[in-house]
């Protein structure tokens, strides 16, 4: 059920980004400082936000969004004991 909800959330987020022009989205990201400095998984290095290509901007911002979601779940589990939010490994790979 959580996977379905996560999929819906991801799809909604994708649609929102698709509705924004690349330029406006880039400006909003820079203005809000999206992403922070936390590093993601292997081979997932953050790209600079100066990319002109809209696909690149989307991929970059979306991966940062995913990282933030993962970190939020982690913090909830380890510092908040919210175990229901722990990521399970079933069906992941």
């Amino acid at each position: 059920r959580r996977d379905v909800a996560h999929g819906i959330l991801n799809e909604a987020y994708r649609k929102v980004l698709d509705q924004l022009s690349a330029g406006k989205h880039l400006q909003s990201l820079v203005a809000r400082g999206v992403g922070g400095s936390l590093g993601g998984g292997a081979g997932d290095d953050a790209e600079p936000l100066s990319k002109r290509h809209s696909d690149g901007i989307f991929t970059d911002s979306y991966s940062r969004y995913r990282k933030q979601m993962a970190v939020k779940k982690y913090l909830a589990a380890v510092l908040g004991k919210r175990y229901k939010q722990r990521v399970k490994n079933k069906g992941r790979r």
Epitope: G36, S37, L38, G40, G41, A42, Q68, A70, V71, K72, K73, Y74, L75, A76, A77, V78, L79, G80, K81, R86, V87, K88, N89, R92, R93
Partner: antibody, heavy 112, light 108 residues
């Protein structure tokens, strides 16, 4: 007895690499977040990063690029690969299940 | 995010009420702030999570409070086993977990 045991620490030259292991006994680590934290001699605790149950790892900004966390669920073990080591990486390295069960730590000394 | 603990060293006697503060440079995400106890040569021990919730098996003389950027750990009546170093740790979406610098509680 439920415990985590780190191994692989020791003396390494600057620029060298080291892989630390964190093995669990009495508990299945597969569905837990696993965290690495270090502590330089006489200093405080410093968070390195974590790996989730699916194998995705996240790092503090200073650790990204030089440090890699991985896990082998079949061996109930988590790893910390450290590259391009510097003198300031000298510390006791701890692994923790979530943050409530910790290993005893393993000392890494980077010196020529 | 920077967590600043005060005092850095605290001298106290058995039976004293002890208070340690942890101040964050920015709001701690979700109030996800924990307290750890560490003795020399040992691993940290988890005491309190989500600012005020006591970990299972931790004596009730330990308590935590606070929200946002200001947090407190209180030991209502210091026991011989409580002389140690205490660390706060806060949730930071950008950096994962930030630890405070520690407070050493020593015998007066």
């Amino acid at each position: 007895e439920v415990q985590l045991v780190e191994s692989g620490g020791g003396l390494v030259q600057p620029g060298g690499s080291l892989r630390l292991s964190c093995a669990a006994s009495g508990i299945d680590l597969n569905s837990y977040y696993m965290t690495w934290v270090r502590q330089a001699p006489g200093k405080g605790l410093e968070w390195i990063g974590f790996i989730d149950a699916g194998g995705d790892a996240y790092y503090a900004s200073w650790a990204k690029g030089r440090f890699t966390i991985s896990r082998d669920n079949s061996k109930n073990t988590v790893y910390l690969q450290m590259n391009s080591l510097r003198a300031e990486d000298t510390a006791v390295y701890f692994c923790a299940r979530d943050l409530d069960l910790w290993g005893q730590g393993t000392l890494v000394t980077v010196s020529s | 995010q920077v967590l600043t603990q005060s005092p850095s060293t605290l001298s106290a006697s058995v039976g004293d009420r002890v208070t340690i503060t942890c101040q964050s440079s920015e709001s701690v995400y979700g109030n996800y702030l924990a307290w750890f106890q560490q003795k020399p040569g040992k691993a940290p021990k988890f005491l309190i999570y989500e600012a005020s919730k006591l970990e299972s098996g931790v004596p009730s003389r330990f308590s935590g409070s606070g929200s946002g950027t200001e947090f407190t750990l209180t030991i209502s009546s210091l026991q011989p086993d409580d002389f140690a170093t205490y660390y706060c740790a806060g949730g930071d979406i950008s950096e994962g977990v930030a630890f405070g610098g520690g407070t050493k509680v020593e015998i007066k």
